[in-house]
């Protein structure tokens, strides 16, 4: 058993590189990483996706992209990404790191994800060797990162097969380890040079200062020039630690994501990694091998590098990788008003009062299938029903028998009598009209408006609410 | 809760074209991906394919020359013909749902026996 | 496509002991996307595991489900009378969709 641990050191456009992707999001940003180890170097063992393991990242600083300005560096996330193995360590094995970006902006359905690059490489690496380090590029990002395998105890060996368990753990005091395989002893961790970086250097003999891939110096602290030293053939230059460039089409590695350039006449060739394909391997062949889909999706195609594949994501999920959760609400699928709710698995409805249904579809006030008693008419509207109720009657359902003197209609002392179409007004003296709301003039012309044609002042009048009325 | 209701005819001559229907109740067939599955006499589950109300369709390969599915989302139902059939298409015809958080089948019809013969 | 290999083709127990269905498929099944399900004769197949050890909604505790990559294991512990059927895995990572060919339960 043991830990796969990856440090990513940077990530950002290559030398000449103008990546476009950083600058498509519309708001703040942050990178995480995922690492997938897959076992043997061969095209066949490579097939299984992941099957030594897999790690995500945590998510790294906020940062807010800037089209104008020159892209830096972008920031990190802090710490190593660990992959845990629980059987023997395969010493060969291919390493495939993806760079995503998650877009914080307030676009629907919550952050968005997509990947900026993907880089694989395929290694031989020992158990509890030092740090290898490693400059590999993806289009025009380029990604610096360091890797290494150790054994967790009590395993050791090259491969964390071999068990070393002193016979008194206690014996192992602080800054001690346990003993070499199949001795009874513990042993120290030799002492790298003082100041030596402890980022950068390593050291296997006690006082000396070896340096990762990338960095040079007694302490390696200085950063190799990378514009001089990838990928270059030539003789070492003692004074940078840089090779220096010979002639050739295979000049500064054309082949990006690990793939190596060989001549041919007056041109090169790229021979790609699994997973790549282009003139430049720039092109990334990702098959349903590889497991790309997210979130339940279904990898459909794909089965070699040169188809396509396509993820079939579940409702709820969308993106070429089924990486981003659709927002199921903004397509306003509740009716009436209803509040919507996504769970994930399903969605719900939570309705207004009033309303029922999957979608809050049902009017549970509306007519359809609703009496007004005793003669009384339904009426929709504003999302509700009422019912207008025959005279003598009242209520929600018209149920309930209505005295129509009750609120006393009739004005200025009028005398008010129920009737079966309503209710009569019997007026006081000097007031005449259905409520006797109109005062009689003393010369005896009526305050009342002109007498609809047909009718001659003085006839009992009938209005359009028709209630029977009498002046006196 | 959710229903699903296999109908079509019980017997079709070979060389003619199998046409299925599911009704599917209680639950819009909008929200989900929907499939077929047959299951010969005494044998195991093949997967036919599925369909999904925007069109999407995936079929298996082995009969992908030979299925069509379709679905109506005004009858909340969804079909199923399979062309040039033999006898050794003769099966248990399922219609499944696919759950929401992967392509598993969730809900399943009772099934519907189909057999080919003259 | 992916193969899945269910292993043994029948297992014979009694109720009370402890039931172990092996599914191999012959490619890592990328996140764990396997489900596994029960038929009885007759009936259409119930869903009782998904993603490798989640339970689908009804399923009594009794079932569980592990593994990952390769090697996928349904554990029935404790075998009631009900449980003696027809179980097949399937995986649905990788189109096209495939089934196992099943291990039959069956009273000892």
């Known amino acids: 058993a043991g830990v796969f641990e990856l440090q990513i050191h940077s990530f950002g456009p290559g030398p000449g590189g103008a990546p476009r992707s950083p600058y498509s999001a519309r708001g703040p940003c942050r990178l995480f990483f995922r690492v997938c180890l897959k076992p043997g170097l061969s095209e066949e063992a490579a097939e299984s996706p992941c099957a030594l393991g897999a790690a995500l990242s945590a998510r790294g600083p906020v940062y807010t992209e800037q089209p104008e300005a020159p892209a830096p560096d972008l920031p990190l996330p802090n710490g190593l990404l660990q992959v845990p193995f629980r059987d023997a360590w395969p010493g060969t094995f291919s390493l495939i790191i993806e760079t995503w970006r998650e877009e914080l902006g307030d676009q629907i359905g919550g952050p968005a994800w997509s990947l900026l690059a993907r880089v694989t490489r395929r290694r031989r690496l020992a158990a509890g060797g030092p740090w290898a380090g490693d400059i590999q590029r993806a289009g025009a990002w380029e990604l610096r990162f360091s890797y290494r395998a150790r054994c967790e105890l009590p395993a050791v060996g090259t491969a964390c097969t071999r068990l070393c368990r002193p016979r008194s753990a206690s014996r192992c005091g602080p800054g001690l380890r346990p003993c070499a395989p199949l001795e009874d002893e513990c042993e120290a961790p030799p002492v790298c040079r003082a100041g030596c970086s402890l980022e950068h250097g390593f050291c296997e003999q006690p006082g000396e200062c070896r340096c990762l891939e990338g960095w040079t110096g007694p302490l390696c602290m200085v950063p190799v020039s990378t514009s001089s030293c990838l990928g270059l053939r030539g003789p070492s230059s003692t004074t940078t630690g840089c090779l220096v460039p010979g002639p050739g089409p295979c000049d500064g590695n054309p082949c990006a994501n690990g793939g190596s350039c060989s001549e041919t006449p007056g041109s090169f060739e790229c021979t790609c990694p699994r997973g790549f394909y282009g003139l430049r391997c720039e092109v990334s062949g990702v098959t349903c091998a590889d497991g790309p889909c997210f979130n339940g999706g279904l990898c459909v195609g794909g089965a070699d590098p040169d188809s396509a594949y396509i993820c079939h994501c579940p409702p709820g999920f969308q993106g070429s990788n089924c990486e981003k959760r659709v927002d199921r609400c903004s397509l306003q699928p509740c009716r009436n008003g209803g509040l919507c709710l996504d769970l994930g698995h399903a969605l719900r409805c939570r309705c207004r009062a009033g309303f029922a249904g999957p979608r809050c579809e049902h009017d549970l006030n509306d007519c359809a299938g609703r009496a007004c008693a005793n003669g009384g008419t339904c009426v929709e509207g504003g999302g509700a029903h009422r019912c207008s109720c025959a005279l003598g009657f009242g209520g929600r359902d018209c149920r309930e028998r209505a005295d129509p003197c009750a609120a006393r209609p009739c004005a200025h002392g009028g005398r008010c009598y129920a009737h079966f179409s309503g209710l009569v007004c019997a007026c006081a003296p000097g007031y005449m009209g259905a409520r006797c709301e109109f005062p009689v003039h003393p010369d005896g012309v009526s305050a009342l408006p002109a007498a609809p044609p047909g009718l001659r002042p003085g006839d009992p009048q009938r209005y359009p609410h028709h209630h029977h009325h009498h002046h006196h | 809760q959710v229903q699903l209701q296999e109908s079509g005819p019980g017997l079709v001559k070979p060389s003619e074209t199998l046409s299925l229907t599911c009704t599917v109740s209680?639950?819009?067939?909008?929200?989900?991906?929907w499939s077929w599955i047959r299951q010969p006499p005494g044998k195991g589950l093949e997967w036919i394919g599925y369909?999904?109300?925007?069109?999407?369709?995936n079929y298996n390969p082995s009969l992908k020359s030979r299925v069509t599915m379709s679905v109506d989302t005004s009858k909340n139902q969804f079909s199923l013909k399979l062309s040039s059939v033999t006898a050794a298409d003769t099966a248990v015809y399922f219609c499944?749902?696919?759950?929401?958080?992967?392509?598993?089948?969730?809900?399943w019809g009772q099934g519907t026996m189909v057999t080919f013969s003259s | 496509e992916i193969v899945l290999t269910q292993s043994p083709g029948t297992l014979s127990l009694s109720p009370g002991e402890r039931a172990t269905l092996s599914c191999r498929a012959s490619?890592?099944?990328?996140?764990?996307?396997l489900a596994w399900y029960q038929q009885k004769p007759g009936q259409a197949p119930r869903l009782l595991i998904y993603?490798?050890?989640s339970r689908a909604t009804g399923i009594p505790d009794r079932f569980s489900g592990s593994g990952s990559g390769t090697e996928f294991t349904l554990t029935i512990s404790r075998l009631e009378p009900e449980d003696f059927a027809v179980y097949y895995c399937?995986?649905?990572?990788?189109?096209?969709?495939?089934f196992g060919q099943g291990t039959r339960l069956e009273i000892k």
């Open positions: 499944a749902r696919l759950s929401n958080w992967g392509f598993a089948f969730d809900i």
């Open positions: 209680n639950v819009s067939i909008s929200s989900y991906y």
């Open positions: 369909i999904y109300y925007s069109g999407t369709t």
């Open positions: 399937q995986q649905y990572g990788w189109s096209p969709i495939t």
């Open positions: 993603g490798a050890s």
């Open positions: 490619q890592t099944i990328s996140s764990s996307y």
